[in-house]
Interface confidence: medium
C-alpha cells in the first residue's frame, strides 16, 4: 500500500534528499514573484496525509543560490 | 563496532527473484535511515533504495522502482531487498550503507543474473 | 537531475600531492555537501571525507576536501602505495563516475 513520511522521519528524509540547503514544509511558488497566490499544499498533506516519492520530497528542497568560488 | 554483514546474493534467472538481507550490530538500529547501494562489475556506485529509520518511508532509483523493494525488521536489526523481475543489468555487488551519508558500508553480496 | 564528474584516473608517486575533482553539472554543488569514499582493490567503500571537509575519526589527515562554487576536491598527501584505490564523490544519493588513482613506482 501507500506509505506515508510524517513527523522527525519526514525531517529525516528531507536532509538525505535536500543536504544542506534546507527545506520548505510549504512549497515555494513564483520566486521574486509578488503576486499573492492561494494557500499552497504542504509537504505534510502530499506526503503525510498521502504518499510521495524522493522527486516529490526535492521540490520542497530550498532554491539552489549562486556561490561565489572561495 | 559498527558491522553490516549482507547475505542472500546468489545466481539468478532473467525475471527471477531474490531476497538480500544485511544484518546489523553494534550502533542504535532504530536511530538510522538505511540504503542499498551497488556496484557492477568493473563499474562504479549505484544508489538503489532508501528505508526511513523506523520503516514508514522507501524510496527508490528509476532503474529498480516497481521492480525492487526495500524493507526493514527493527526487532531483529536487519535491512532487506525484495528483488523480483531480475534482469542482466541488475548484475552487481550490492551493499547495505548506514544513514543519509552512508559511514558505515557492508561486505557486499554478489548477484548475478543470467541465462 | 544532478550529474557528477571526476577524472576517470590520475597518479602520482609516491610523497607526492594529487587532487581529484568533482564537477556539478546544471545544478551547484556549492549548497549541497559533498562526501568522498574510497575503495581499496576487492573491498567495499569506506567514508573518506563527509560533510565537504571532515574527517571520520581514523581517517589520515593526509587526507583533505574542499569545495568552491560548482566543484569539490579531494586532495591527497604525502602519498603511499596503500593508497593505490577507486574514489567516489557523492551528493545525497548520488554518486561521481569514480576515478581510480594509481601510485608510480
Known amino acids: 500500500g501507500p506509505e506515508t513520511l510524517c513527523g522527525a522521519e519526514l525531517v529525516d528524509a528531507l536532509q538525505f534528499v535536500c543536504g544542506p540547503r534546507g527545506f520548505y514544509f510549504n512549497k515555494p511558488t513564483g520566486y521574486g514573484s509578488s503576486i499573492r497566490r492561494a494557500p499552497q499544499t504542504g509537504i505534510v498533506d502530499e506526503c503525510c496525509f498521502r504518499s510521495c516519492d524522493l522527486r516529490r520530497l526535492e521540490m520542497y528542497c530550498a532554491p539552489l543560490k549562486p556561490t561565489k568560488a572561495a | 563496532q559498527v558491522e553490516l554483514v549482507e547475505s542472500g546474493g546468489g545466481l539468478v534467472q532473467p525475471g527471477g527473484s531474490l531476497r538480500l538481507s544485511c544484518a546489523a550490530s553494534g550502533f542504535t538500529w532504530s536511530s538510522f535511515a538505511m540504503s542499498w547501494v551497488r556496484q557492477a562489475p568493473g563499474k562504479g556506485l549505484e544508489w538503489v533504495s532508501y528505508i526511513s529509520y523506523l520503516g514508514s518511508y522507501t524510496g527508490y532509483a528509476d532503474s529498480v522502482k516497481g521492480r525492487f523493494t526495500i524493507s526493514r525488521d527493527n526487532s531483529k536489526n536487519t535491512l532487506y531487498l525484495q528483488m523480483n523481475s531480475l534482469r542482466a543489468e541488475d548484475t552487481a555487488v550490492y551493499y547495505c550503507?548506514?544513514?543519509?551519508?552512508?559511514?558505515?558500508w557492508g561486505q557486499g553480496t554478489l548477484v548475478t543474473v543470467s541465462s | 537531475d544532478i550529474v557528477l564528474t571526476q577524472p576517470p584516473s590520475v597518479s602520482g608517486a609516491p610523497g607526492q600531492r594529487v587532487t581529484i575533482s568533482c564537477t556539478g553539472s546544471?545544478?551547484?554543488?556549492?549548497?549541497?555537501?559533498v562526501h568522498w569514499y574510497q575503495q581499496l582493490p576487492g573491498t567495499a567503500p569506506k567514508l573518506l571525507i563527509y560533510?565537504?571537509?571532515k574527517r571520520p575519526s581514523g581517517v589520515p589527515d593526509r587526507f583533505s576536501g574542499s569545495k568552491s562554487g560548482t566543484s569539490a576536491s579531494l586532495a591527497i598527501t604525502g602519498l603511499q602505495s596503500e593508497d593505490e584505490a577507486d574514489y567516489y564523490c557523492?551528493?545525497?544519493?548520488?554518486f561521481g563516475g569514480g576515478t581510480k588513482l594509481t601510485v608510480l613506482g
Open positions: 546544471s545544478s551547484n554543488i556549492g549548497t549541497y555537501d
Open positions: 550503507a548506514r544513514g543519509t551519508k552512508f559511514d558505515y
Open positions: 560533510s565537504n571537509s
Open positions: 557523492s551528493i545525497t544519493r548520488v
